[in-house]
C-alpha cells in the first residue's frame, strides 16, 4: 500500500535568480485533487495554500513581492490528497542578485580565439567575496564555480565552437546572495578544423532573456522556460 504520494515539482518564475526588490513566484505542481500545499523555507513551514476546487487545480503559486536577502535560501513544497502527504519536492535554491557591487569579466587571450586555443575567464570583484559564478547563455547548463580573494579563474581549456556564446559572472556573498551580473562577454571561436569532430553548438536565447535559459534535467520539459536548473542548483549546495 502506498504510504506517500509522488513528490511535486518546484520552480521559480520568472527565474530562481531574483534581483533584489523584484517579485518572484514560487510554483509547486502536484496532482489534481490535492487539498493542501505547504511551502517550506529552510526546513520550516513558510506558507500554505488550499486550492479550490482541488480537483481542477494541480499547481499553486506562492508570491514574493519584494525579494531580499532574508527571502533567499532553500525552498521545498509538499501536498496532501485526503490524509496522504506527498514526498517533499527537490530543493529550490532561491538566489537574490544585484547585491552590493558589479564584477568585471574578462577573457584571455581574447574574446576571439582559434578552435583548440586555451581560454580562461577571469571574474573580478573588489568587495568582500570569495566565491564567483560563471554562467553561459544557452539551453544547456553552463555554470561554473570559482574561488579567489578578489578574482576567480575559470579555465575552459582548449575550446571548440561549442564554447561560443555570451558569458556573465557573479560574485557570491553567500550561497544565496549574489552580486549584480557582470557586463556580458561574447566568446567567438573561429577556425577551420580538419579531421576533428566537434561538439555541436548550443542553441541560445536572445541576450535579453539570458536569465531564463536554465532548464531542469529532472523532467526534460520546459514550463514557461522557468524551471529551475538541476545543475545550477546543485552547484549552490
Amino acid at each position: 500500500q502506498q504510504q506517500t504520494l509522488p513528490k511535486p515539482f518546484i520552480w521559480a518564475e520568472p527565474h530562481f535568480m531574483v534581483p533584489k526588490e523584484k517579485q518572484v513566484t514560487i510554483c509547486c505542481q502536484g496532482n489534481y485533487g490535492a487539498v493542501e500545499y505547504q511551502l517550506h523555507f529552510e526546513g520550516s513551514l513558510f506558507a500554505v495554500d488550499r486550492p479550490k476546487p482541488p480537483e481542477r487545480i494541480n499547481k499553486v503559486q506562492f508570491y514574493i513581492p519584494d525579494m531580499n536577502s532574508r527571502m533567499a535560501g532553500q525552498y521545498s513544497c509538499i501536498y496532501r490528497v485526503g490524509e496522504l502527504w506527498s514526498e517533499p519536492s527537490n530543493l529550490l535554491d532561491l538566489v537574490v542578485t544585484e547585491m552590493y557591487d558589479t564584477p568585471t569579466l574578462s577573457v584571455h587571450p581574447g574574446p576571439e580565439v582559434i578552435s583548440g586555443e586555451k581560454v580562461t575567464f577571469y571574474c573580478r570583484l573588489d568587495t568582500a567575496t570569495s566565491m564567483f559564478l560563471l554562467l553561459k547563455e544557452g539551453r544547456s547548463s553552463h555554470v561554473q564555480r570559482g574561488y579567489g580573494k578578489v578574482q576567480a579563474e575559470f579555465p575552459l581549456g582548449p575550446v571548440t565552437t561549442a564554447h561560443r556564446g555570451t558569458y556573465r559572472c557573479f560574485g557570491s556573498y553567500n550561497n544565496h546572495a549574489w552580486s549584480f551580473p557582470s557586463e556580458p562577454v561574447k566568446l567567438l571561436v573561429t577556425g577551420d578544423i580538419e579531421n576533428t569532430s566537434l561538439a555541436p553548438e548550443d542553441p541560445t536565447f536572445p541576450a535579453d532573456t539570458w536569465g531564463t535559459y536554465l532548464l531542469t534535467t529532472e523532467t526534460g520539459l520546459q514550463k514557461d522556460h522557468a524551471l529551475w536548473d538541476h545543475t545550477a542548483q546543485n552547484l549552490l549546495r
Epitope: 574578462s106 584571455h108 587571450p109 581574447g110 576571439e112 578552435s115 583548440g116 573561429t190
Partner: antibody, heavy 116, light 107 residues
C-alpha cells in the same frame, strides 16, 4: 626559456611558393597558438593568421586567404607558413609569434625576397 | 576589421623627458590592447599587455592606460635605448590588427 627559431632567408621567383618554419622550445607547444606576422621593408606589422597546434584549428587574415597555409607538427614542435603565388609585394620579413594573450614571444624573422 | 590608428607618426623627445604615445581603435576593444617595441633589424618585443598590465623584464618606466577605443603608452623618463618604433595591437577580434607605428626619435 621560450625560443622560436625560424628557417633561413629565401629568394623566390614571382608565382612560386615559399615555406617558412618556426621551431618552438621551452614550453608545451600544443598549449599556445602560433601566429605569423609579416613586415614589408620600411612598413608596419601585418597579421597573416594563426594555428592551434593541438587540433589544427586555423584562422587566416582574409587578405591572404587561399594563398597562405599554416600548419603545425606537434612531434617536432614546429609551425610552418606556406605562401603561394608569390609577387614582388610579398617581399618582407616573416615572423612567427606565440600568442599568450598578446604575442609574448617572437621568432627572429625570416627574410623572403621575391624577385625575377 | 578593427583599424588601429597611432599618433603621432613621429615623436621627437629628449632623453630624460616623458613620452606619450597614443593609439585609437575604430571600435571598442575593451582592454584587449597590446604594445610592442621594435628596433631596427630586430623582432618586436612585448611591452604592455591588456592595455595596462606590465611584463616581466620590462622596465617600470613603461606604462599603459586606456580602455574602449583610446589608449596611451607612457615612457616616464626616456633612456637612450628607448628610441625605437612602437606598435599597438588589437587583441580583441580577428583579423588581429596593428597600428602603423610611432617612431620615437631623439630630439
Amino acid at each position: 626559456q621560450v625560443q622560436l627559431v625560424q628557417s633561413g632567408a629565401e629568394v623566390k621567383k614571382p608565382g612560386s611558393s615559399v615555406k617558412v618554419s618556426c621551431k618552438a622550445s621551452g614550453y608545451t607547444f600544443s598549449e599556445y597558438t602560433m601566429h605569423w606576422v609579416r613586415q614589408a621593408p620600411g612598413q608596419g606589422l601585418e597579421w597573416m593568421g594563426g594555428i592551434s597546434p593541438n587540433i589544427g584549428g586555423t584562422s587566416y587574415n582574409q587578405k591572404f586567404k587561399g594563398r597562405v597555409t599554416i600548419t603545425a607538427d606537434k612531434s617536432t614542435s614546429t609551425a610552418y607558413m606556406e605562401l603561394s603565388s608569390l609577387r614582388s609585394e610579398d617581399t618582407a620579413v616573416y615572423y612567427c609569434a606565440r600568442r599568450g594573450g598578446s604575442f609574448d614571444y617572437w621568432g627572429q624573422g625570416t627574410t623572403v625576397t621575391v624577385s625575377s | 576589421e578593427i583599424v588601429m590608428t597611432q599618433s603621432p607618426a613621429t615623436l621627437s623627445v629628449s632623453p630624460g623627458e616623458r613620452a606619450t604615445l597614443s593609439c585609437r581603435a575604430s571600435q571598442s576593444i575593451s582592454d584587449y590592447l597590446h604594445w610592442y617595441q621594435q628596433k631596427p633589424g630586430q623582432a618586436p618585443r612585448l611591452l604592455i599587455k591588456y592595455a595596462s598590465q606590465s611584463i616581466s623584464g620590462i622596465p617600470a618606466r613603461f606604462s599603459g592606460s586606456g580602455s574602449g577605443t583610446d589608449f596611451t603608452l607612457t615612457i616616464s623618463s626616456l633612456e637612450p635605448e628607448d628610441f625605437a618604433v612602437y606598435y599597438c595591437q588589437n587583441g580583441h577580434s580577428f583579423p588581429l590588427t596593428f597600428g602603423q607605428g610611432t617612431k620615437l626619435e631623439i630630439k
